[in-house]
């Protein structure tokens, strides 16, 4: 079972200095959205799948990996416009004749139902309601993901309240 990420509570001591180092927190970078144990960044521009992959790398992240139907639904709930779709980190491996995530794992048959062709140069994108395959050269928006990381934030004690 995955660990749940709740809100952090902090014991505030009686004697406080002006600035105190806050305990470890799970934080997403600015502009990234927290979705359970991940931080997601929805692009504002469009790119072919390979360029999208590269862009996520430059942000020290990866194209979105979806573990199960629940995560798919949670992500789709963040897509507020039915007329926009996003590349994810899944493409067709011709050598293995299977859908392959960019972390090297293969798509389980019950994970996602992909509408479209499973063939060379096919990559996967998600919309508000569906999952599709498309030519990887197609220019679309994309989603990068980061695992939530532990950071030490210096904060004013008053901001704890």
């Amino acid at each position: 079972q995955k660990p749940s990420i709740g809100k952090c509570s902090v014991d505030i001591q009686q004697n406080r200095t002006k600035t105190t180092e806050r305990p470890d927190l799970l934080n997403c970078p600015i502009y990234w959205q927290q979705v359970q144990e991940k931080c997601l960044l929805f692009s504002h521009t469009v790119n072919p799948w390979n360029n999208s992959l590269a862009d996520c790398s430059t942000k020290e992240s990866s194209l979105l990996l979806i573990q199960d139907k629940d995560e798919l639904t949670r992500t789709q709930n963040l897509i507020h416009d039915k007329a926009i779709s996003f590349w994810i980190g899944l493409n067709f491996s011709l050598s293995e004749k299977n859908w392959k995530w960019i972390n090297g794992s293969f798509l389980s048959s019950n994970d996602l139902k992909i509408t479209g062709d499973a063939k060379e140069n096919s990559c996967v994108y998600i919309s508000q309601t569906s999952v599709y395959s498309e030519y990887c050269s197609t220019e679309m928006k994309w989603i990068c993901q980061k695992e939530l990381t532990l950071v030490r934030n210096k904060v004013s004690p008053d901001s704890w309240l």
Partner: antibody, heavy 122, light 108 residues
Framework: QVQLVESGGGLVQPGGSLRLSCAAS????????MSWIRQAPGKGLEWVSY????????AYADSVKGRFTISRDNAKNSLYLQMNSLRAEDTAVYYC???????????????WGRGTLVTVSS | DIQLTQSPSSVSASVGDRVTITCRAS??????LAWYQQKPGKAPKLLIY???VLQSGVPSRFSGSGSGTDFTLTISSLQPEDFATYYC??????????FGGGTKVEIK
């Protein structure tokens, strides 16, 4: 205001050339697949060509391949269609159209210009 | 090329009538089908895409259904502004994108 405005149509002799332009406004032009679609007088619709957001991918209907060239200038929010070796059967209203962003190269046209009439006649 | 055959080519109907237009593809196109409305002297307007998804701003009296080769556009209660010509369009990966011949909805 979100709109597309075509220009450049007119009367041209067979074998002649024309360049159509489409000015886009009110949306982020550089993110959309754009197409030209035509309609001969009293007839149905015919897709002519599309171009991807960056201009890297282009496709044409067989009827215009080798004669028409689609291009775009994202800095100017403009789409173009260079038409050479024009024939009588190219006579039509030419529409510039934007595609829905959600469906990749499955191009559904959600925004159209009013069209510009091209007449090819001697 | 994938051919789309619309029927009927024209239909006479009255305000309040239920109108059904069909579009048949020469080969299977999954759900890659759109419906457009065009009025004289105007550009077409997207009504339905992906066979059944209502485009934003389009009245709910319009609906689409079908998959594979047979598709239907239904206007549940015809309004005065609905008298127009309707076209289906297929958008599979097999170029060119093609349109049906059109169905003219006229006032009875």
């Amino acid at each position: 205001q979100v709109q597309l405005v075509e220009s450049g149509g007119g009367l041209v002799q067979p074998g002649g050339s024309l360049r159509l332009s489409c000015a886009a406004s009110g949306f982020t032009f550089s993110q959309y697949y754009m197409s030209w679609i035509r309609q001969a007088p009293g007839k149905g619709l015919e897709w002519v060509s599309y171009i991807s957001p960056s201009g890297a991918t282009i496709a044409y209907a067989d009827s215009v391949k080798g004669r028409f060239t689609i291009s775009r200038d994202n800095a100017k929010n403009s789409l173009y269609l260079q038409m050479n070796s024009l024939r009588a059967e190219d006579t039509a209203v030419y529409y510039c159209a934007r595609s829905l962003m959600s469906t990749g190269t499955h191009l559904y046209f959600d925004l159209w210009g009013r069209g510009t009439l091209v007449t090819v006649s001697s | 090329d994938i051919q789309l055959t619309q029927s009927p080519s024209s239909v006479s109907a009255s305000v309040g009538d239920r109108v059904t237009i069909t579009c048949r593809a020469s080969q299977g196109i999954s759900s890659w089908l759109a419906w457009y409305q065009q009025k004289p002297g105007k550009a077409p307007k997207l009504l339905i895409y992906a066979a059944s998804v209502l485009q934003s701003g389009v009245p709910s009296r319009f609906s689409g259904s079908g998959s594979g080769t047979d598709f239907t556009l239904t206007i549940s209660s015809l309004q005065p502004e609905d008298f127009a010509t309707y076209y289906c369009q297929q958008v599979t990966s097999f170029l060119p994108y093609t349109f049906g011949g059109g169905t003219k909805v006229e006032i009875k």
